[in-house]
């Protein structure tokens, strides 16, 4: 028995932050679990982990130097990405795992969302002047 | 409270197999990972692999991967590691590890006694 | 895979000094370093977890610090019972790795 997982095929980062919105077939309510995130078409980097726990406040982590927070709902997570560079444009695939009670369970792999991380504008844009000098 | 019940020894002949066992108490057994840790007399401590026992996944150092198998029977809480083909390189002592799954508490915080390993001929 | 380097290999102090032993990874591990104690015929025990976190019941003369490639264990005021081998150990990726081990002696 698997998890289903649902996530928007594409977001664009424009201010080189995020939110990706994981939606789970189950209820994670009162339940020991490891939502995660992944990054690329073979899901080698593991972007960002939540850990919760029905005796303990969540906890939110990364070990691969990416600025994340999370939020949990009945039946999502939500990733919050900051400070990402042009160059993590990828596909991102969520991940959960239901530790206890038993049995374990995870999700079958998903479409994945597409993260397309667009520059900063360093300068004005013409169309949006910034304000006069008196 | 949490243990991690390990054999005393074992006396192997050259080119036969052991199986290791690691029995765990005192804690939810699906929460964590169970890591063997392998070290020789006098020397450094090596990581082997680990396996997550909710799902079965393993994880092993190149090193190992042909000299050891790690299992885990969840009906009993025991982890096992099964090693071929024994050799004098590995004479040591194995220790099963546990560490979280979940959390971002991420180290080995409980060991077992450990299993010393002869192979002699 | 990543390499732990620690040094020294071996130390002598006297008891009330204030002892230094450092790991040096290969690559960036942040924060993701741990440290054990492993006492003469003993089990390894772990002491600090992610880089500076001290485990339940250890004695606060034991310290950690360091983030990336570079991580230091601190003992003040030596005990004798800190006659041990100390192991640092990289928890970032897999495979995990220790660094070679520090062997503490006291004058």
């Known amino acids: 028995n698997k998890i289903l997982v649902k996530q928007s095929p594409m977001l664009v980062a424009y201010d080189n932050a995020v939110n990706l919105s994981c939606k789970y077939s189950y209820n994670l309510f009162s339940r020991e679990f490891r939502a995660s995130l992944h990054k690329g078409l073979d899901s080698a980097v593991e972007v960002c982990v939540v850990y919760g726990n029905y005796s303990q406040q969540l906890q939110v982590y990364s070990k691969t130097g990416f600025n994340c927070d999370g939020k949990l709902g009945n039946e999502s997570v939500t990733f919050y990405l900051q400070n990402l560079y042009v160059n993590q444009t990828d596909i991102y695939f969520c991940k959960i795992e239901v530790m206890y009670p038993p049995p374990y369970l995870d999700n079958e792999k998903s479409n994945g969302t597409i993260i397309h991380v667009k520059g900063k504008h360093l300068c004005p844009s013409p169309l949006f002047p910034g304000p006069s000098k008196p | 409270q949490v243990q991690l019940q390990q054999p005393g020894s074992e006396l192997m002949r050259p080119g036969a197999s052991v199986k290791l066992s690691c029995k765990a108490s005192?804690?939810?057994?699906?929460?964590?990972?169970m890591h063997w840790v392998k070290q020789r007399h006098g020397q450094g401590l090596e990581w082997i692999g680990n396996?997550?026992?909710?799902?079965?996944?393993?994880i092993y150092d190149e090193k190992f991967k042909s000299k050891a198998t790690l299992t885990v029977d969840t009906s009993s809480s025991t982890a096992y590691m099964h090693l071929s083909s024994l050799t004098s390189e590995d004479s040591a002592v194995f220790y099963c590890?546990?560490?979280?799954?979940?959390?971002?508490?991420?180290?080995?915080?409980?060991w077992g006694q450990g299993t010393s390993v002869t192979v002699s001929s | 895979d990543i390499q732990v380097n620690q040094s020294p290999s071996s130390l002598s102090a006297s008891l009330g000094d204030t002892i230094t032993i450092t790991c040096h990874a290969s690559?960036?591990?942040?924060?993701?370093l741990n440290w054990y104690q492993q006492k003469p015929g003993n089990i390894p025990k772990l002491l600090i977890y992610?880089?500076?976190n001290l485990h339940t019941g250890v004695p606060s003369r034991f310290s950690g610090s360091g983030s990336g490639t570079g991580f230091t264990l601190t003992i003040s005021s030596l005990q004798p019972e800190d006659i041990a081998t100390y192991y640092c150990?990289?928890?970032?990726?897999?495979?995990?790795?220790f660094g070679g081990g520090t062997k503490l002696e006291i004058k």
């Open positions: 590890t546990r560490s979280h799954y979940g959390s971002s508490f991420d180290a080995m915080d409980y």
């Open positions: 005192g804690y939810t057994f699906t929460s964590y990972w």
């Open positions: 396996i997550y026992p909710g799902s079965g996944r393993t």
């Open positions: 690559q960036n591990i942040y924060v993701w």
């Open positions: 992610k880089a500076s």
């Open positions: 150990q990289q928890g970032q990726s897999y495979p995990w790795t």
